[in-house]
């Protein structure tokens, strides 16, 4: 098995992830593993020398960088919060704070905004990934209601009066729950006609 450094006339290396082509010497040299950087470049007689990233810096990939990247905190002013810390092998992982969605994306989220309210009678469609997009409000399905303007309220099933030993006084709608009453309670005068039928 050939180990770096080795000559390459076609400018390609055997292991693209862990090696790179050095055009000045026309050789393939080792990249440095994640969490390290190049402290001494390779030559025809000596392979790349790597050193560990200093505290508060990182390199995520096999690389031939001469520096490590600086760790950056999640910016709360931009609505971001940390979900995993920066280490020598990984940058800080951020996500939108609860109740927010990503409004600006440049390789990663850079700015979050408040989720829109869903009006009564609707709820936010459930997303695969929290914080990915703004709310898309969908109507409550039959037999359910939601009576507030909220970014997170869910439609609830209408109360079943009979389960509580009561009778229905007014049916539920998408925006209100069923109204129940005692079977012995008399109906208001305007409803007594319906009752007789």
């Amino acid at each position: 098995q050939v180990v770096p450094p080795y000559g390459s006339e076609n400018q390609t290396c055997r292991d693209q992830e862990k090696e790179y082509y050095e055009p000045r010497h026309r050789i393939c040299c080792s990249r440095c593993p994640p969490g390290t950087y190049v402290s001494a470049k390779c030559s025809r007689s000596r392979d790349t020398v790597c050193a560990t990233c200093a505290e508060n810096s990182y390199n995520e990939h096999w690389n031939y960088l001469t520096i490590c990247q600086l760790c950056r905190p999640c910016d709360p002013v931009m609505g971001l919060e940390e979900i995993a810390p920066c280490t020598s092998k990984r940058k800080t992982q951020c996500r939108c704070q609860p109740g927010m969605f990503c409004a600006a994306w440049a390789l990663e989220c850079t700015h979050c905004e408040l989720l829109s309210d869903c009006p009564p009678g609707t709820e936010a469609e459930l997303k695969d990934e929290v914080g990915k997009g703004n709310n898309h409000c969908v109507p409550c399905k039959a037999g359910h209601f939601q009576n507030t303007s909220s970014p997170s309220a869910r439609c609830q099933p209408h109360t079943r009066c009979e389960d509580q030993g009561l009778v229905e006084a007014a049916p539920g709608t998408a925006q209100s729950d069923t109204t129940c009453r005692n079977p012995s309670e008399s109906l208001p005068p305007e409803m007594s006609g319906t009752m007789l039928m």
Partner: antibody, heavy 121, light 113 residues
């Protein structure tokens, strides 16, 4: 040869204190994070605490927060764990472990042989 | 905290046969930016400390025999010993280092049948 050697374990009464030490050799101690990991007899491994290479960042398992303190002396290549208000459930073999990282959140590539801590009256 | 669940608790395999150990994490440990799973496997023999076998779910630590291999992604992982040797009798642990605190599975004991 890369090596970690723990000391300071022993028998202590509930409510008592103990200070564990871990002497490191064979690597640039200040470049790497260190952790304490414990194993109660016949039980799972449990990460106890971690400290970054410089000593500027520390973290603790909820079970020991407020009772244990991790520290390091990079000039002496030594890691410490100060354990106060010890409880019976702290009884375990305590290992010091090196991370391949300045942050403790990584694979533990080198482990010490462990030191036994017994909390009993 | 991310909970790591290993199965089976113990495993008896004939010499030269394949041993398969499973590990499931309660949350995704795949970091999409570098496509790496922040999961390790350790081997612990009686009276000894754990020894790192595999990191990033599938990368063998130097000096580890190639009969040990790791696979899986996201939440489901496997450690395979392709041809069990007598010296492989041990307890095997998975551990996630995706988020603080790092957490371990409770181990799988591998014995010879």
């Amino acid at each position: 040869e890369v090596q970690l050697v723990e000391s300071g374990g022993g028998l202590v009464q509930p409510g008592g204190s103990l200070r564990l030490s871990c002497a490191a050799s064979g690597f640039t101690f200040s470049s790497y994070a260190m952790s304490w990991v414990r194993q109660a007899p016949g039980k799972c491994l449990e990460w106890v605490s971690g400290i970054s290479g410089s000593g500027g960042r520390t973290n603790y398992a909820d079970s020991v927060k407020g009772r244990f303190t991790i520290s390091r002396d990079n000039s002496k290549n030594t890691l410490y764990l100060q354990m106060n208000s010890l409880r019976a459930e702290d009884t375990a073999v305590y290992y010091c472990a090196k991370s391949d990282n300045w942050h403790y959140l990584d694979a533990f590539d080198i482990w010490g042989q462990g030191t036994m801590v017994t909390v009993s009256s | 905290d991310i909970v790591m669940t290993q199965s089976p608790d113990s495993l008896a395999v004939s010499l030269g046969e394949r041993a398969t150990i499973n590990c499931k994490s309660s949350q995704n440990v795949l970091y999409s930016s570098n496509n790496k799973n922040y999961l390790t496997w350790y081997q612990q023999k009686p009276g000894q400390p754990p020894k790192l076998l595999i990191y990033w779910a599938s990368t063998r630590e130097s000096g580890v025999p190639d009969r040990f291999s790791g696979s899986g992604s996201g939440t489901d992982f496997t450690l395979t010993i392709s041809s069990l040797q007598a010296e492989d009798v041990a307890v095997y642990y998975c551990q996630q280092y995706f988020n603080t605190p790092p957490t371990f599975g409770c181990g799988t004991k591998v014995e010879i049948k």
